[in-house]
Interface confidence: low
């Protein structure tokens, strides 16, 4: 069969070879369309609720004046000419619709690199057959599944038209350090071929890259966090970042009830202050971020010290902040 | 690759009823429109029933009108076909079939067929 596409609206006109140019004429059409329940036969004399929808010419070509999602099938014609030879002509139509251009809608104005960002959505509305939606990154195709690429697609029908809406959901992950202003775009390729793509507009996202904190720096007097009973720890907060964030302080891992300060100062050392301590910095930009744990303990006249981070048990005596 | 495939047939005594059932796998099931058709032995295959891809149209075979009523369950991939009042002369294979491109164009995909036998 010859493939012929044609586009929804239009009119199409197919040839019956072997016919002779006007009546009288052998020849009979057989349809095997949606709008048919199995083959329907059309004469030249036609009439009748069909003549609406093809109708057949005086030269034997079958005229569809606007073409639907429902004259999709198979067209055969049989024709004898003057002398009693058979030609047939056999036809497979394929519609098509083009839709409008794909547009982005929500598209971000911004991404954060290093976690996973929705771009936008593309949007594709009328057309047919289906055909698919593909995004693109400076003008090269993105993957889906590939360096923290995911799409997800959604393809909708119009209850009435048959025509399709389709939509793609991007979300990606830029690299730290990557491009600052990438470029995004994306496309509709036509389900039939010999159509060419359709390109949204681009979109432009900033990419911001979050700052990398320091290390916020717990260091306990004396070292080790060893002290005699009776004796004073001095816990001191550094935090590198600038403004000075607010320093909060941990023990056993409960936020002790005290004012912020960088310093935590431990006087007249009782087996109620023994525990875990850690200090926990709070930058307006970047949430909280909190330092290793340290271990305070007491250790009675001849023992040995034991080493800064073991654990030691609980309890909340008297507290000084500098 | 799409592929349907039908149950529910069996034997019945004329006037009894039988729900035919089609599921279909391979591609986005609720964009199609489907068709039931039968072969009795020695005959040609003829078309019983048909469902648009929304479900909100159908189309019945002048034999089987009032009688037989199909319908589909997207979520489900399934499309049923509902014989009430059954006569010795449905006796046939059932077949469903899916159409390639449109509600309307011809139907390019075949189920096996389930027989449907109905004894007087």
């Known amino acids: 069969a010859q493939n012929i596409t044609a586009r929804i609206g239009e009119p199409l006109v197919l040839k019956c070879k072997g016919a002779p140019k006007k009546p009288p004429q052998r020849l009979e059409w057989k349809l095997n369309t949606g709008r048919t329940e199995a083959w329907k036969v059309l004469s030249p004399q036609g009439g009748g609720p069909w003549d609406s929808v093809a109708r057949v010419l005086p030269n034997g070509s079958l005229f569809l004046p606007a073409v639907g999602i429902q004259d999709e099938g198979i067209f055969r014609c049989q024709a004898m000419n003057r002398n009693g030879k058979e030609t047939k002509s056999n036809y497979r139509v394929r519609v098509y619709q083009i839709p409008g251009k794909p547009e982005i809608v929500d598209s971000a104005s911004e991404l954060t690199a290093g976690v996973p960002n929705k771009v936008g959505t593309c949007v594709s509305e009328g057309s047919y057959p289906a055909g698919t939606l593909s995004w693109h990154l400076d003008g090269k195709p993105l993957v889906p599944n590939e360096k923290g690429v995911s799409v997800k697609e959604q393809t909708r029908r119009h209850p009435e038209t048959g025509l399709f809406t389709l939509q793609s959901e991007l979300m990606v992950t830029p690299a730290r350090g990557g491009d600052p202003r990438p470029t995004f775009s994306c496309s509709f390729s036509p389900g039939l071929p010999r159509h060419r793509a359709l390109r949204t507009a681009p979109i432009q996202p900033r990419v911001w890259e979050p700052v990398p904190l320091e290390e916020v720096q717990l260091v306990v007097e004396p070292e080790g966090g060893a002290v005699a009973p009776g004796g004073t720890v001095t816990l001191t907060c550094e935090v590198p970042a600038q403004p000075s964030p607010q320093i909060h302080w941990m023990k056993d891992g409960v936020p002790l009830p005290l004012p912020p300060s960088p310093v935590l100062i431990l006087p007249e050392i009782g087996p109620q202050d023994q525990g875990t301590y850690s200090c926990v910095a709070t930058h307006s930009s970047h949430g909280p971020q909190e330092s290793r744990a340290v271990s305070i303990s007491i250790i009675e006249p001849g023992e040995e010290g034991p080493t800064a981070g073991s654990v030691g048990g609980s309890g909340l005596g008297t507290l000084a902040l500098a | 690759e799409v592929q349907l495939v039908e149950s529910g047939g069996g034997l019945v005594q004329a006037g009894g009823s039988l729900r035919l059932s089609c599921a279909a796998s391979?591609?986005?099931?609720?964009?199609?429109?489907m068709g039931w058709f039968r072969q009795a032995p020695g005959k040609e295959r003829e078309f019983v029933a048909g469902?648009?891809?929304?479900?909100?149209?159908?189309l019945y075979a002048d034999s089987v009108k009032g009688r037989f009523t199909t319908s589909r369950d997207n979520a489900k991939n399934t499309v049923y076909l509902q014989m009430n009042s059954l006569k010795p002369e449905d006796t046939a294979n059932y077949y469903c079939?899916?159409?390639?491109?449109?509600?309307?164009?011809?139907?390019?995909?075949w189920g096996q067929g389930t027989q449907v036998t109905v004894s007087s």
């Open positions: 469902i648009s891809w929304s479900g909100d149209s159908t």
């Open positions: 391979g591609r986005i099931f609720n964009n199609y429109a």
């Open positions: 079939a899916e159409k390639q491109g449109a509600d309307w164009a011809p139907y390019d995909y």
